[in-house]
């Protein structure tokens, strides 16, 4: 059985202040079944972005269909991008369960945010 | 704004339990990552535990097997089970809430909690 | 586990006078360190994160510096409230998050 890759393409995503930014996300399988989460940091104070099971998220948007039999793409928008929003982001894989259980996360992608061009 | 209000704290013999919680408002908690961290009194701080948004848990070594951190996000809480408790884990104990970068942004005001026979 | 230290333990200043305290760490940590202020009796207050940014509501009279191992919190023409305890606090590794044993800023 191959072992299921979580990938994020880019290293870093640059944009200004006020754009979108598209933090790009795949996965190599759709085995297991479980919910893909983002993230913003690493470790205790990792702050979620983004849940399409729950949550009320109203700066992001999914890319493609996350509801769609066999997608997988997890890509997302995040839109009006403050310098705040900077900093890394993890595409985070889990397997279904009572709580889900965390498998596999994405290299991440720093974005950093230059300043609105006058 | 955040507010996060600490309650449990208490006089407990050693080798006795006591649970802690600490109840966020000002934000939302399911999303973040929260702390908690300890003051032995006239000493310096010392982060102790953490729960993050995914609910992960981080414990420092001398709690470890000793102390859980949980949290209910329907009840905006955050909760330390202490058991087996040492006289050196006399202090006053402050729940805080914990950036994406991992440094504490917002802390309660602490609750005592005294270890002693 | 990144052991910091903070010189100097205890600091006599007068009013309006700078201050500088320093934070160094037992290894490099990227410029991920946070300052907080302790008055007595109150919950310590994020001054500082990621080396030179100053938290929001912070005044301009407190700025931090440094790279790599060594770390200093500056206070410009120090007023009466900012009498406390100063800690520091690395954010670059979580296993575990560690303070500093704090510096103690007291009226000369």
């Known amino acids: 059985e191959e072992e299921l890759q979580v990938i994020q393409p880019e290293k870093s995503v640059s944009v200004a202040a006020g754009d979108s930014a598209t933090l790009n996300c795949t996965v190599s399988s759709l085995i297991p079944v479980g919910p893909i989460q983002w993230f913003r940091g690493a470790g205790p104070g990792r702050e979620l972005i983004y849940n399409l099971k729950e949550g009320h998220f109203p700066r992001v948007t999914a890319v493609s269909d996350p509801t769609k039999r066999n997608n997988m793409d997890f890509s997302i928008r995040i839109s009006n991008i403050t310098p705040a929003d900077a900093g890394t982001y993890y595409c985070v894989k889990f397997r279904k369960g009572s709580p889900d259980v965390e498998l596999k996360s994405g290299a991440g992608t720093e974005l950093s945010v230059r300043a609105k061009p006058s | 704004d955040v507010q996060l209000v600490e309650s449990g704290g208490g006089l407990v013999q050693p080798g006795g339990s006591l649970r802690l919680s600490c109840t966020a408002s000002g934000f939302t908690f399911r999303n973040y990552g929260m702390s908690w961290v300890r003051q032995a009194p006239g000493e310096g701080l010392e982060w102790v535990s953490a729960?993050?948004?995914?609910?992960?848990?981080y414990y420092t070594d001398s709690v470890k097997g000793r102390f859980t951190i949980s949290r209910d996000n329907s009840k905006n809480t955050l909760y330390l089970q202490m058991n087996s408790l040492r006289a050196e884990d006399t202090a006053i104990y402050y729940c805080?809430?914990?950036?994406?970068?991992?440094?504490?942004?917002?802390w309660g005001l602490g609750t005592l909690v005294t270890v002693s026979s | 586990e990144i052991v910091l230290t903070q010189s100097p333990g205890t600091l006599s200043v007068s009013p309006g006078e700078r201050v500088t305290l320093t934070c160094r760490a037992s290894?490099?940590?990227?410029?991920?360190i946070a300052w907080y202020q302790q008055k007595p009796g109150q919950a310590p207050r994020l001054l500082i994160y990621?080396?030179?940014s100053r938290a929001t509501g912070i005044p301009g009279r407190f700025s931090g510096s440094g790279s790599g191992t060594e770390f200093t919190l500056t206070i410009t023409s120090l007023q009466s409230e900012d009498f406390a305890v100063y800690y520091c606090?690395?954010?670059?590794?979580?296993?575990?998050?560690?303070f500093g044993g704090g510096t103690k800023v007291e009226i000369k």
């Open positions: 805080a809430k914990v950036t994406w970068n991992n440094f504490f942004d917002y």
């Open positions: 990621d080396a030179s």
């Open positions: 606090q690395q954010h670059y590794d979580w296993s575990p998050l560690t």
């Open positions: 729960s993050s948004g995914s609910g992960s848990t």
């Open positions: 290894q490099g940590i990227a410029g991920k």
